[in-house]
Interface confidence: low
């Protein structure tokens, strides 16, 4: 299953697949979740190790058994791959390290006046991988504002240096926000020349194309199909790259088929994992197990369940098969992709969904064994849960925010039903940014049920608590997926970094806005939530957030939207936007309903009709 | 000191190819851009391009792009910038300059081409 | 490309006298304004550049100000040295662009 928990001050011994710099343990843990055999990380932060040469180590590692002996080194940061958690699966990587200085080629030096400029400019650049920025402070004027676009061979930087005054990212052409655009197009017949940065072999020229997306260099590839001329040429797909970031030459060559990467597709790209399965075709690796299991579907099932399957065949052969079960072979090779593609077989074959970002049905929680006020300008895919809830009658209009915590269920506050419980009036929106992309012909959810907290009562700010289920799922993509839930019982205090979002009002007499504002928020205790509201009960099941001398807070429109926080790399639900005395009056908190507190009754109601829980519980 | 030696006059025939180096030293020659600014004879300045000689990246003024094309040696620390299919109105003083934080700080002392028949 | 528009094209002075050159980008180019001198068969010389930096070799009667499009070049007390061209150059946005160049000359 999916393990999120990061061990502290602990080193994984032995099984290293592969080693390289990462910044963060965040970004080394999406490198192992994306290596076709890490199953374990440990890295390494510079305060945890004097050896300059193993600082911002990132240590990718394999294990047969899943696990690995843990020995105590004080600063390292362990933990799992994110394969098979499904919406948690993501090559997105936002974050800016400031003191940081990410070593790598760099081909382009520009002039500009701040590090999202130069984050900007690093995702519209075809070969950008990550970038440096000097900012106006930096000790030599020389390289003031520099923005040093770079790249390398493994797409991480060839070396992290602790440098002041310097700031550091990636490009977020894996978050689908890149302004280049991409070629959906597949040319049959034609071959594409240039330099070639890898080989594998795959069933068809899309799997050939996912694999180029998701590679640091590929730009485009060549794949010869299994009637190509040279039979051991069959079935390779050759990963491609080039100077100006376009082949310099393409030959028509009957039996080929070539394209691109569809890295710098802009709001959506293909999920990291293949679904297909191909019908008489056998595909070879080495031997992980063979289970005996009825029909191919299930046989992929098992591959997925199997952490360290990376492909499968299902053998159809008699002597194969005992009454309806036949034989499934789970198998993984050095690269994830099969040592061998065989037609005209008895078999099925097809590869592991362990990549796959929709991943189960269920809600997402943490596992371990009202405009905003004083708020900024959101940007695309930044709140990816963050929905708006639209009323429809005569007009229609912005009414409260919500969040989306699986394929069909949204969570919001109570009190946005309140004179309006009739589910056929409601459109819920999801994936936008600005209220004004809304048109008559944008797609839209409808309510197939509410559900409002049994103990909520109209007027009263307790149990502010509702449920949405949707009419027909979501599918996940960067701009549209859901948050996190805490564990039952989670403690705030943890949670240092918090934020909430929505398009309410940005002044207590103002006006719903119409791009989604953000703002952050720290947390404040329930004692002194409730010195500031004498005349309410502030209980354990609400959660407080705000300045003391106010200026930012959620408002009217926000209600129902998220209170979200930062921990350990991962966002969670803490609270969602209820009630407070005005709009970011001083000494006046928000008040928010503490998710945490209804756990169980969300596990509950979002049981499906069968029985099966739509969620994984918090353990 | 930081100093850049450019190359000597050089007279061209239209159509020809004209190459003009420009040596560094006083300085990390990786570590800084080269750029090269022309100005035609009573004319203003002209930017036509830089290089980066750590990595060999290139970044051209579209106005130039397909004739003009900037190299590097970093065994001599000389940096070269040739324009070909040279015109009448390519008659100037090319200079490579060294920026320092954002503008140009230092200058070659200049190298005048003339295309004539 | 971001065009720069300096006036005037030539003024003449006396030495003593205040000298303001205008430069004006056709988009904003945030402060990333830099002023050259260039003296007959020279190379030019970095003069002034962003909100504060002023080159080393040159004398504080050489101001720059100016926000967004707008920037001007204030020679407080002009000085017989002075007599010059001065460019202003955009380093915002590439192509960086100059000036056509403001010719100061003793009246």
């Known amino acids: 299953g999916c393990l999120t928990q990061l061990y502290e001050n602990a080193f994984f011994r032995g099984g290293d697949v592969a080693s390289m710099y990462t910044p963060n343990a965040q970004y080394c843990q999406m490198r192992c979740t994306f290596h076709p055999r890490c199953l374990l990380f440990s890295f390494l932060p510079a305060s945890s190790i004097n050896d300059m040469e193993k600082r911002f180590g990132c240590f990718l590692k394999d294990s047969v058994t899943g696990t690995l002996p843990k020995v105590h080194r004080t600063g390292a940061v362990s933990g799992h791959s994110l394969k098979q958690c499904g919406h948690q699966i993501s090559a997105c990587h936002r974050d800016i390290y400031k003191g940081v200085d990410m070593r790598g080629v760099n081909f382009n030096v520009s002039k500009v006046s701040s590090v999202e400029e130069c984050q900007k400019r690093c995702t519209s650049n075809i070969r950008c991988q990550f970038f440096s920025y000097a900012t106006q402070t930096f000790h030599k004027a020389e390289y003031r504002n520099n923005c040093l676009l770079k790249y390398s061979p493994g797409g991480t930087p060839t070396a992290i240096k602790v440098l002041s005054n310097v700031e550091s990212g990636f490009s977020l052409k894996p978050c689908a926000l890149s302004e280049i655009g991409c070629h959906m197009n597949i040319f049959q017949h034609l071959a594409f020349s240039d330099v070639d940065v890898a080989r594998v072999l795959t069933p068809d020229a899309f799997v050939c194309r996912t694999i180029c997306t998701y590679h640091p260099n590929c730009l485009f590839f060549t794949f010869y199909t299994n009637v190509w001329k040279i039979e051991s040429q069959r079935n390779v797909c050759l990963l491609k790259t080039s100077e100006s970031g376009t082949p310099s030459s393409s030959t028509p060559q009957e039996n080929t088929i070539s394209g691109y990467s569809l890295l710098t597709c802009k709001r959506t790209l293909p999920e990291p994992c293949h679904s297909k399965i191909y019908p008489g075709v056998d595909f070879g690796g080495e031997e992980l197990n063979v289970t005996f299991v009825k029909g191919v579907n299930v046989c992929q099932e098992t591959c997925t369940k199997m952490i360290r399957c990376q492909f499968f065949t299902y053998s159809l052969l008699p002597e194969d098969c005992k009454e309806e079960k036949c034989k499934c072979f789970l198998r993984l090779s050095m690269d994830g992709s099969p040592t061998r593609i065989a037609y005209g077989t008895q078999g099925s074959s097809g590869y592991s969904l362990r990549l796959c970002n929709t991943g189960d049905n269920s809600v997402c929680t943490t596992k371990t064994s009202t405009r905003i006020v004083g708020g900024t300008n959101s940007s695309w895919g930044e709140w990816p849960w963050q929905v708006s809830l639209q009323v429809k009658l005569t007009a229609q209009r912005h009414l409260c925010g919500g969040s989306l915590i699986g394929h069909q269920w949204v969570l919001t506050a109570a009190h946005c039903f309140d004179g309006l419980p009739l589910q056929d009036v409601w459109r819920i929106y999801s994936g936008i940014l600005n209220l004004s992309d809304i048109t008559k012909d944008t797609p839209f959810s409808q309510i197939k049920e509410i559900i409002i907290h049994q103990n909520y009562k109209v007027s009263e700010g307790n149990h502010d608590i509702a449920l949405i289920k949707l009419q027909a799922p979501l599918n996940y993509t960067e701009f549209q997926k859901p948050i996190c839930l805490p564990s039952k019982g989670d403690t705030s205090t943890i949670y240092t970094n918090c934020w909430v979002t929505g398009w309410g009002f940005s002044k207590e007499k103002g006006e719903i806005q119409n791009i989604l504002q953000k703002v952050n928020i720290p947390l404040v205790t329930n004692e002194e939530c409730q010195k500031r509201y004498q005349d309410y009960k502030i209980t354990q099941r609400m959660v407080c957030a705000g300045y003391k001398e106010g200026g930012k807070d959620a408002c009217k429109g926000d209600s129902g939207g998220p209170l979200v926080c930062k921990h350990n790399g991962m966002w969670r639900l803490v609270g969602i936007t209820s009630w407070g005395e005005g709009c970011a009056r001083r000494e006046q908190p928000g008040v928010y309903t503490k998710v945490a507190e209804y756990m169980d009754w969300i596990l509950e109601k979002t049981q499906s009709s069968d029985g099966k829980a739509q969620m994984q519980s918090p353990a | 000191q930081v100093q850049l030696q450019q190359s000597g006059a050089e007279v061209k025939k239209p159509g020809a190819s004209v190459k003009v180096s420009c040596k560094a030293s006083?300085?990390?020659?990786?570590?800084?851009?080269m750029h090269w600014v022309r100005q035609a004879p009573g004319q203003g300045l002209e930017w036509m391009g830089a290089?980066?000689?750590?990595?060999?990246?290139?970044a051209y003024n579209q106005k130039f792009k397909g004739r003009v094309t900037m190299t590097r040696d970093t065994s001599t620390s000389t940096v070269y910038m040739e324009l070909s299919s040279l015109r009448s109105e390519d008659t100037a003083v090319y200079y490579c300059?060294?920026?320092?934080?954002?503008?140009?700080?230092?200058w070659g002392q200049g190298t005048l081409v003339t295309v004539s028949s | 490309d971001i065009q720069m528009t300096q006036s005037p094209s030539s003024l003449s002075a006396s030495v003593g006298e205040r000298v303001t050159i205008t430069c004006k980008a056709s988009?904003?180019?945030?402060?990333?304004l830099a002023w050259y001198q260039q003296k007959p068969g020279k190379a030019p010389k970095l003069l002034l550049y962003?909100?504060?930096g002023l080159e080393a070799g040159f004398h504080l009667r050489f101001s720059g100000s100016g926000s967004g499009t707008h920037y001007t070049l204030t020679i407080s007390s002009l000085q017989p040295e002075d007599f010059a061209t001065y460019y202003c150059?955009?380093?915002?946005?590439?192509?960086?662009?100059f000036g056509q160049g403001t010719k100061v000359e003793i009246k």
């Open positions: 006083g300085y990390t020659f990786t570590d800084y851009e």
């Open positions: 962003g909100e504060t």
């Open positions: 150059q955009q380093y915002w946005s590439t192509p960086w662009t």
């Open positions: 300059a060294r920026p320092y934080g954002y503008p140009f700080a230092y």
């Open positions: 988009e904003d180019i945030y402060n990333r």
């Open positions: 290089i980066h000689p750590g990595s060999g990246g290139t």
